[in-house]
């Protein structure tokens, strides 16, 4: 670039030859002469970004070698300057090689493989091997720069390519470049933990590892504990890993030895890169002793009737974790321990459920049933009450000697016992007869048992033949039996 | 001529910190990948550390991952290693070493030595 | 982390006569790009290290020709066509597909 000035202000200096580009032969004399009064320094900065100084007007480079092509800058005191392109060309280098190759996705890369002749044709990038270059790459060849990648893709780390040009129509190639291309970073990192609570005793090891993914190994990441302004932990383990070139991750173990009761809190995991920031919290509750807290069962009073099944369900906290569960009936020792299971799938939770299966339930089979759960520091109990619904079953109906009928049923609920009167021709029984006694026999040993209920009535009221019908109900069933009167008396059941 | 010089080792009590630089010499420095790798003594090579040419990438080993930093100065062709809660493990030779093009170590130091000693 | 494993530990050899160091990664070392991301290093007495073989096969400038690297994937050999006295020390394989290992070392000393 020559100068060009209007008379009256400074001009930029001269340089001779004029011209803007000039090509010397390697081993040939290089002479650059910088004309200006107030010349202060000629300046050669090399393909390698470097400048050379020269304080002398005149710039000679005897025997110039190929490395000697570059800009050369002359300046003057005004601060102007003019600068003229030298090509040192030479048969042997044709090829000015600037390692290594970087960039970043989404921009360009510089290929650093100036000419030293640019008479050559066909300066182009090729990849290493002679295979293809990726088809959406697209480069600019500047002779006097190198080639530029244009839009770094990730899918170009680690492409291996040379420069290459023709000269009298023979391939030359330079040395090669691997590209290490640099994630543009598009996204938070992704951070995550396997548990968000946890509950420990006082002198537990408390270990939490938080998954830190991103695609550079640039991501920062921490522990802190929150109570309430963040602190730093320090005492953390660090694991990382390139699961691919693009696709890094890092584990963060933190560890607290023997946790103490003042070691609760909320404790966070931070990750950060140039795109934001992502975090996830965990909460460490430390307790003095272990515990078991049953839950409230809303009633411990169970009704089943004969024959069906019933679940007795108990749901409870425990730490630690439950080593003996049982099922007590009637205060003996029960063979079924019921089916115990971990309410939710958090491996840390503390909650649990057991359910007692009583299937086809007899009778006889009600009474007290008792769940103990116990760990290493606390035990827990609750007691069902199940009472078995039965349909009422007569036991016994006689005429006694003193001229009374007497009926006894047994079931639960307490049976109502009616009796009724009908004669032969009737067909159901529907005359209501008052009786003269009822009393309930509390003949069980448990109150859970079966009641037993007598009744009579007084037979002399009976004029004419025929039935006598006692009936006992109760809220799941009845049964009747009947007498009958006739000139030969008789006496049949029908159930 | 082309060539790395570490300097900063020394001995240092446990928990202490330490600097390490490598001046860089005879080659367009702010081009190339820089790493640290130590050797304990008697012992094998370890990778410690790499910044990219112009220190926006880093990465450790994880053994000292959040206690040293890499960094470097472009302006004055130097590479750093600062080193924070030392532990006597860290004890060790100390080399800095350019990534070529092909991502192999093709210039080293003459390393400096870290001593870790209560 | 990729482990890299070499033997022998150590290696007497006769000057003159060939040697040969296997290293071998629990993970293969070849990228997509087709090259095998393994390098060699000697580490002579009181020196530091310097780089041998570079990409699985390719010498560095300067490192005699009888010294050769082969193997791809996870197996790879350095081989000495005939020893000389100047090549004790100790070899180390590299790998700088991922996060850069070292191999545990081989030493090579004249018998």
């Known amino acids: 670039s020559q100068p060009s000035a209007s008379p009256g202000e400074p001009s930029p200096p001269s340089i001779h030859p004029a011209q803007s580009e000039l090509i010397v032969e390697a081993g040939d004399t290089l002479s650059l002469t910088c004309i200006d009064p107030d010349f202060v320094r000629w300046t050669f900065k090399t393909y390698f970004n470097e400048m050379v100084e020269n304080k002398k007007n005149e710039w000679i480079q005897e025997k110039a070698e190929a490395t000697r092509t570059g800009t050369y800058t002359c300046s003057n005191s005004n601060g102007l300057t003019s600068s003229i392109y030298v090509f040192v060309r030479d048969p042997a280098k044709l090829f000015l090689v600037g390692l290594p190759l970087f960039g970043k996705e989404d921009s360009d890369a510089l290929v650093r493989c100036p000419l030293t002749d640019p008479q050559v044709s066909n300066y182009s990038l090729i990849e290493c091997d002679g295979k293809s270059l990726p088809t959406d790459l697209t480069f600019v060849p500047n002779p006097k720069a190198g080639i530029t990648i244009k839009n770094v893709k990730r899918a170009y780390h680690r492409l291996c390519v040379r420069c290459a040009a023709q000269r009298d129509g023979t391939w030359l190639h330079s040395d090669k470049f691997t590209l290490k291309v640099r994630a543009a970073i598009k996204a938070i990192p992704v951070v995550s933990v396997p548990e968000t609570s946890h509950l420990l005793k006082k002198g537990d090891t408390f270990t939490v590892v938080c998954t830190i993914k991103d695609v550079s190994t640039s991501v920062n990441s921490m522990w802190l504990k929150m109570n309430p302004q963040p602190q730093h932990i320090a005492q953390v383990k660090h694991n990382s890993w390139h699961r691919g070139d693009f696709n890094y991750e890092r584990q963060e173990t933190l560890t607290i030895s023997s946790a103490r009761v003042d070691d609760s809190g909320v404790f966070m995991c931070y990750a950060n890169n140039t795109f934001g920031s992502a975090n996830v919290t965990t909460t460490l509750k430390v307790v003095e002793k272990g515990f078991i807290n049953i839950s409230p069962v809303k009633n411990t009073t169970v009704f089943v009737t004969d024959g069906e099944n019933v679940d007795l369900v108990v749901e409870y906290e425990a730490y630690p974790k439950p080593e003996h569960q049982q099922w007590i009936y009637m205060n003996r020792t029960s063979a079924n321990k019921g089916k115990d299971y971990v309410k939710s799938d958090n491996k840390s939770n503390i909650r649990y459920v057991n359910q007692l299966r009583l299937t086809r339930l007899k009778g006889t089979e009600g009474g007290t049933y008792t769940f103990l759960v116990s760990n290493s520091d606390a035990s827990a109990s609750v007691t069902f009450n199940v009472y078995v619904n039965t349909k009422p079953e007569i036991l016994t109906y006689d005429r006694l000697i003193n001229g009374m009928l007497q009926c006894v049923a047994e079931g639960f609920p307490e049976p109502t016992i009616d009796w009724y009167f009908c004669t032969g021709a009737e067909q159901r029984c529907t005359t209501p007869v008052s009786p003269v006694d009822v009393q309930v026999q509390n003949v069980s040993v448990s109150p859970f048992g079966k009641l037993v209920v007598q009744s009579s009535i007084d037979s002399s009221v009976f004029r004419h033949n025929g039935t006598v019908e006692c009936k006992a109900s109760n809220d799941v069933g009845k049964s009747s039996a009947f007498f009958n009167f006739a000139f030969k008396e008789q006496i049949q059941a029908h159930t | 001529q082309v060539q790395l010089v570490e300097s900063g080792g020394g001995v240092v009590q446990p928990g202490r910190s330490l600097r390490l630089s490598c001046a860089a010499s005879g080659f367009t420095f702010s081009r190339y990948g820089m790493h640290w790798v130590r050797q304990a003594p008697g012992k094998g090579l370890e990778w410690v550390a790499v910044?990219?040419?112009?220190?926006?990438?880093?990465d450790y080993t994880d053994s000292v991952r959040g206690r040293f930093t890499i960094s470097r100065d472009n302006s004055k062709n130097t590479l750093y290693l600062q080193m924070n809660s030392l532990r006597a493990e860290d004890t060790a030779v100390y080399y800095c070493?350019?990534?070529?093009?092909?991502?192999?170590?093709?210039?080293w130091g003459q390393g400096t030595t870290v001593t870790v000693s209560s | 982390d990729i482990v890299m494993t070499q033997s022998p530990l150590s290696l007497p050899v006769t000057p003159g006569e060939p040697a040969s160091i296997s290293c071998r990664s629990s993970?293969?070392?070849?990228?997509?790009?087709?090259?095998?991301?393994l390098d060699w290093y000697l580490q002579k007495p009181g020196q530091s290290p310097q780089l041998l073989i570079y990409?699985?096969?390719n010498r560095a400038s300067g490192v005699p020709d009888r010294f050769s690297g082969s193997g791809s994937g996870t197996d790879f050999t350095l081989k000495i066509s005939r020893v000389e006295a100047e090549d004790v020390g100790v070899y180390y394989c590299m790998q700088a597909l991922q996060t850069i290992t070292f191999g545990q070392g081989t030493r090579l000393e004249i018998k």
């Open positions: 910044i990219w040419y112009d220190g926006t990438n880093k």
């Open positions: 070493a350019r990534e070529d093009w092909a991502e192999a170590f093709d210039m």
């Open positions: 990409l699985g096969s």
């Open positions: 993970q293969s070392l070849l990228h997509s790009n087709g090259y095998n991301y």
